[in-house]
Every structure is written in C-alpha cells, then in structure tokens.
C-alpha cells in the first residue's frame, strides 16, 4: 500500500497534507469538469454566434436535458440529502448520451471533449459510492439513447451547433447546482 516516502507500510500516516476526503475529492472533480466545459464553450462561442442567439427554443424542443427542480431536494428550501444525491447521479447518467454526442463536435478541443466525458464517468463512480440508495437510481435505456444520438447527429448544421451550445450550458448549470447541493451534505 502506498505510504509517504520513508515511512513503514505497517503504519500508514498521512503526508504533509491530509488525505482527500470523499467530499473534497467530489468537489474537485466537479470543478475539473466545469473547467473543461469552459474550454469547450470557448471554442463553441468563437466558432459560431450561438452564445448570443435568441433562437434557443427551436433546438430545445429536441432535447430533454436534465434540470434541477424543487422536488429534487437539491435547493436550500426543502433540501433532502438522499433525494438530491439520487437526482444528481440520475441526471449525470442522463447527460452521458449528450456528452457522447459532443465527441465529434470539436475540432481543436477533441481531447478536452473526451476529458469532460471521462471525468463525468469518474464523478458518477465517486457519487455511487457515496449513495446509500442505489436502487432508486434509474439507468437510461441504451436503445433509447442510441436512437436519440442518431436523431441529434442527423440535424442540420445550425441545429447541431445550437444543440452543442445548449448541452454545454445545461450541463454547466446542472453541475453548479450539484456542487452547491453537495457542499451542504
């Protein structure tokens, strides 16, 4: 087992800094993903005028992006740790198909798009270990996801650009809400 340099493995002690707690590490993971989203949004906004567009409603009809609602127990009023954690994990699982869609949408940020996708998978792993009620978490149907992906990829260029913008914006909002909620847990 890894121990700080020069210490005996029979007596594991922390190095100069304390070992990361579950809450600290989850917090860092979300901030890592948010930094990745910022990098991707930069490319999206530079490439097209989607970030200032007022025609978002047109594309939003095709999307069913996860959103935090009052009933999810993640807001300060009516906060419920267990309900909220289930919502966060379920929402992240639902976002995975949209993150898959993003994989071919970036020219100069291909590696960053992959990092956002993979770091989200890692975050799900961390949160699932934290959750007590894993039975309440519904995993999206792979067949439904596959047909949604096909549908999104068949859109015209303008709608694809708008979809990319909306996914990044919604995912950012969802993660920010999750971060606030998890800090109360």
């Amino acid at each position: 087992a890894p121990v700080p340099p020069g210490e005996d493995s029979k007596d594991v002690a922390a190095p100069h800094r304390q070992p990361l707690t579950s809450s600290e590490r989850i917090d860092k993971q979300i901030r890592y993903i948010l930094d990745g989203i910022s990098a991707l949004r930069k490319e999206t906004c530079n490439k097209s005028n989607m970030c200032e567009s007022s025609k978002e409603a047109l594309a939003e009809n095709n999307l069913n992006l996860p959103k935090m609602a009052e009933k999810d127990g993640c807001f300060q009023s009516g906060f419920n740790e267990e309900t909220c954690l289930v919502k966060i994990i379920t929402g992240l699982l639902e976002f995975e198909v949209y993150l898959e869609y993003l994989q071919n949408r970036f020219e100069s940020s291909e590696e960053q798009a992959r990092a956002v996708q993979m770091s989200t998978k890692v975050l799900i792993q961390f949160l699932q270990k934290k959750a007590k009620n894993l039975d309440a978490i519904t995993t999206p149907d792979p067949t439904t996801n596959a047909s949604l992906l096909t549908k999104l990829q068949a859109q015209n260029q303008w709608l694809q650009d708008m979809t990319t913008h909306l996914i990044l914006r919604s995912f950012k909002e969802f993660l920010q809400s999750s971060l606030r909620a998890l800090r109360q847990m």
């Epitope: 594991v12 922390a14 990361l20 590490r25 890592y32 930094d35 990092a115 890692v122 961390f126």
Partner: nanobody, 124 residues
Framework: GGGLVQPGGSLRLSCAAS????????VGWFRQAPGKEREGISC????????YYADSVKGRFTISRDYAKSTVSLQMNSLKPEDTGVYYC????????????????????????WDQGTQVTVSS
Amino acid sequence: GGGLVQPGGSLRLSCAASGFTLDYYAVGWFRQAPGKEREGISCISSSDLKTYYADSVKGRFTISRDYAKSTVSLQMNSLKPEDTGVYYCAAGTWDLKFGYNISACVGSYEYDYWDQGTQVTVSS
C-alpha cells in the same frame, strides 16, 4: 505481487491503499533496476482516467483501475530480463487541474504517497 518470472512471461502487480481511498488519487508505477535510477514507467489519472506509458513498456504493460476494489493494477506481459527491478506504486494529486500534462506523471516529485516496493525478477 512480485516474484520470479521467465522471459516472455506475465505478472500482475496490484496497488491498494491503507488509510485513504486510492480512487481519489492519480497513481504512478515506478521501477528501480539494480544500480540504476528509479524510473517512472506508467500512470493513470484519477480525474479522467488518462494513461501514460514509458517507451520501454509501451505495448507490453497495461495500467487499470478497479473502483470496486479501490485498486490500481499493472499487467505486465512479454517480460524481459531488463524489466528486473523493484517496482513501486505511488499516489498523488497532479491531475486535478484541467489540461494537466499526462507525460509529466513520471516525475517522482509529483507524488505524496509511496509503497515499500516489490521485487520482480525476470530470469530463466
């Protein structure tokens, strides 16, 4: 664990942690051959699971994480006599800033925790 293996053989090293959760840390594997400097041979990040291999082990060694067991393993195939040495696993937090450089992971100063090492001997 380590041990004696014949050239061309395989061995799997596993790294677990005591007193903290390995899942939350980037993990690197290092080795020290007799009379040589310690060298970084492979690593895996904790943030996005990127992996890195030194040229000397590329295509023969595979690093992986197991979240169920909170371990990181190094699968070593097609072993050569020059793979002989003491193998160490180390854990650190060098990967928590988006855009980190994965190839920098083989610098031993990047790690906070080290294990005591396990001897691997490749000989017929």
